[in-house]
């Protein structure tokens, strides 16, 4: 009983439940392969509880192990289109601070039009995650086709 | 020590750990694109702890942010088969109440025979999730090839 | 306040937050389809908190429902290569104890070069998970392309 009451009084943040789910805002300018994300209840079903957006890139606020997941669907795409525009690749990584830069997750589309994956990875406060899409096909902005999120799992 | 004791005395449900993993029961009749799911220890490794099944569709019992995941494999399928049939698409969405109807996750098979993805999304008590499979290829009922689940992540 | 202090004093293990993320070490000898995994901070971003490795296979230390996830990318692969070497299949299952042997997750590559999926499944202390790759194409050892992990979700 005491625990239940205490739990209700504590802010969720103290439990470390940082979580975010983002939708695609736009692609970068010509030489910038990054996808730019947005989130918040006004936009639909995307949200940020803990992490923040910094110029469309996701910045982590709490150290810990995170589940990172992503799905990207190419717009106006068929298996023929995809194979003719090969290679299209998506990479998720820590892009800043530069000292921690690393690729966490990488997938190629080959003859498919959607990639989806997830992984566990340690992230630190201040890490900014970037999602780089290389290739000549545009990603879909439909919120059920392209999304990116993180979930804090444990310290 | 006191916390550990209190935690042990509390039912898991009060911690909000709602979770379900379902296996395919059957497809719908001709005009019904929905997949019908089943779960429970008697069926193998599927289970429902919190959410319930309502005529083969998953109904949420606790408000919160959920990780929704799905894998669907088409039966007797090859890349040739997949390309020779009408585009097969899977969509996961809230189908009731009607006021909250929305597509959460959508994937096309293109020349592949399996789709798998996951996302974080807010769900409310009473939301029913439907998984719509459009196309003319049957989904596999093998429990390691086709499954659908949700995991409560935070309030 | 009391709750927060108690929580900090408890070892994480008592909360049941077992988690592991592994990277590919090597493939098995000729008649052994298993992938052999490795993990630990010295290797990069892989880790084991609770589960252990037993001759390259992941052994569970705590009963519960786990989220199991995997991504495997085939090395030096294109959709042409993949279709010419078909079928290449990945299966994740409990391989010991023999009495609990079962396939949990199965995917074929078809014309793709990467598979990625995840599922919830009950696992018991002592369960060893094996990942069997059948086919004639080598998996990539790049840590952002091939990885395997589990996350304890609830009892």
């Amino acid at each position: 009983q005491r625990f239940a009451q205490a739990q209700q009084q504590l802010p969720l943040e103290s439990l470390g439940w940082d979580v975010a789910e983002l939708q695609l805002n736009h692609t970068g300018p010509q030489q910038d392969p990054r996808l730019y994300w947005q989130g918040g209840p006004a936009l639909g079903r995307s949200f940020l509880h803990g992490p923040e957006l910094d110029k469309g890139q996701l910045r982590i606020h709490r150290d810990g192990i995170y589940m990172v997941h992503i799905q990207v669907t190419l717009a106006i795409c068929s298996s023929t289109t995809a194979s003719r525009h090969h290679p299209t690749t998506l990479a998720v990584g820590i892009c800043s601070p530069a000292s921690r830069s690393i690729s966490l997750l990488r997938l190629s589309f080959h003859q498919g039009c959607t990639i989806a994956s997830q992984r566990l990875t340690p992230l630190a406060r201040g890490d900014t995650l970037c999602t780089n899409l290389t290739g000549t096909l545009l990603p879909s902005r439909n919120t059920d086709e392209t999304f990116f999120g993180v979930q804090w799992v444990r310290p | 020590q006191r916390f550990a004791q209190a935690q042990q005395q509390l039912p898991l449900e009060s911690l909000g750990w709602d979770v379900a993993e379902l296996q395919l029961n059957h497809t719908g009749p001709q005009q019904d694109p929905r997949l019908y799911w089943q779960g429970g220890p008697a069926l193998g490794r599927s289970f429902l702890h919190g959410p319930e099944l309502d005529k083969g569709q998953l109904r949420i019992h606790r408000d919160g942010i959920y990780m929704v995941h799905i894998q669907v494999t088409l039966a007797i399928c090859s890349s040739t088969t997949a390309s020779r049939h009408h585009p097969t698409t899977l969509a996961v969405g809230i189908c009731s109440p009607a006021s909250r109807s929305i597509s959460l996750l959508r994937l096309s098979f293109h020349q592949g025979c399996t789709i798998a993805s996951q996302r974080l999304t807010p769900l409310a008590r009473g939301d029913t999730l439907c998984t719509n499979l459009t196309g003319t290829l049957l989904p596999s009922r093998n429990t390691d090839e086709t499954f659908f689940g949700v995991q409560w992540v935070r309030p | 306040q009391r709750f927060a202090q108690a929580q900090q004093q408890l070892p994480l293990e008592s909360l049941g937050w077992d988690v592991a993320e592994l990277q590919l070490n090597h493939t098995g000898p000729q008649q052994d389809p298993r992938l052999y995994w490795q993990g630990g901070p010295a290797l990069g971003r892989s880790f084991l908190h609770g589960p252990e490795l037993d001759k390259g296979q992941l052994r569970i230390h705590r009963d519960g429902i786990y989220m199991v996830h995997i991504q495997v990318t085939l090395a030096i692969c294109s959709s042409t290569t993949a279709s010419r070497h078909h079928p290449t299949t990945l299966a994740v299952g409990i391989c010991s104890p023999a009495s609990r042997s079962i396939s949990l997750l199965r995917l074929s590559f078809h014309q793709g070069c990467t598979i990625a999926s995840q599922r919830l499944t009950p696992l018991a202390r002592g369960d060893t998970l094996c990942t069997n790759l059948t086919g004639t194409l080598l998996p990539s050892r790049n840590t952002d392309e091939t990885f395997f992990g589990v996350q304890w979700v609830r009892p």
């Epitope: - | 007797i76 049939h85 049957l138 596999s140 | -």
Partner: antibody, heavy 119, light 111 residues
Framework: EVQMVQSGAEVKKPGASVKVSCKAS????????IHWVRQAPGQGLEWMGD????????SYNQKFRDRVTMTRDTSTSTVYMELSSLRSEDTAVYYC????????????WGQGTLVTVSS | DIVMSQSPDSLAVSLGERATINCRAS??????????MHWYQQKPGQPPKLLIY???NLESGVPDRFSGSGSGTNFTLTISSLQAEDVAVYYC?????????FGGGTKVEIK
């Protein structure tokens, strides 16, 4: 209501070709594969092949591979089955058929077209 | 190719009695949680009519006196209480792989 209406009976000489049509209505033509099945007089049923009207891809029974061609015209929702180098044993009723939800079994059939091969 | 063998070739049953037709595949037609076996009824001068799909599913509009069972290589079509309008030839068909093949047919008559 799904309907499959086939062209009329044909009489052909050995070595000639025949082209049978099947006009589909009552559903989205490009969605469902259309199969061809034949039945010789007093005999059983034999699957010849199928075509996906969405892109025109066809798959043929190896037995007929060198002699059969299946095509479609999406503007008229019609599929065609052409069989060449006809011989007397090709005398049969030729049916087109499609399915109601999933491919593999045939819920809707044409009325059949009798092709007689005789010198 | 998978060879489908039907038995018997013909069957005479009294009105109201049970009729049973068997179909054997040369190798298993069951996979992915389904048995890819289907049954048709054909009357003279008509195209076949789907009765049962995936071994045991009754097609919409088909009387429930028709039922199907079996898995792997052995399948059965049962007419629980034969009616006059059930006089016809019955065919089994598999769709496990290409080419699809049919059984040779069983002629059902009234005794």
């Amino acid at each position: 209501e799904v309907q499959m209406v086939q062209s009329g009976a044909e009489v052909k000489k050995p070595g000639a070709s025949v082209k049978v049509s099947c006009k589909a209505s009552g559903y989205t033509f490009t969605t469902y594969n259309i199969h061809w099945v034949r039945q010789a007089p007093g005999q059983g049923l034999e699957w010849m092949g199928d075509i996906y009207p969405g892109n025109g891809d066809a798959s043929y029974n190896q037995k007929f591979r060198d002699r059969v061609t299946m095509t479609r015209d999406t503007s008229t929702s019609t599929v065609y089955m052409e069989l060449s180098s006809l011989r007397s044993e090709d005398t049969a009723v030729y049916y087109c058929a499609t399915f109601s939800r999933f491919d593999g079994w045939f819920a809707y059939w044409g009325q059949g077209t009798l092709v007689t091969v005789s010198s | 190719d998978i060879v489908m063998s039907q038995s018997p070739d013909s069957l005479a049953v009294s009105l109201g009695e049970r009729a049973t037709i068997n179909c054997r595949a040369s190798r298993s037609v069951s996979t992915s949680g389904y048995s890819y076996m289907h049954w048709y009824q054909q009357k003279p001068g008509q195209p076949p009519k789907l009765l049962i799909y995936l071994a045991s599913n009754l097609e919409s509009g088909v009387p429930d006196r028709f039922s199907g069972s079996g898995s792997g290589t052995n399948f059965t079509l049962t007419i629980s209480s034969l009616q006059a309008e059930d006089v016809a030839v019955y065919y089994c068909q598999h769709s496990r792989e290409l080419p699809y093949t049919f059984g040779g047919g069983t002629k059902v008559e009234i005794k």
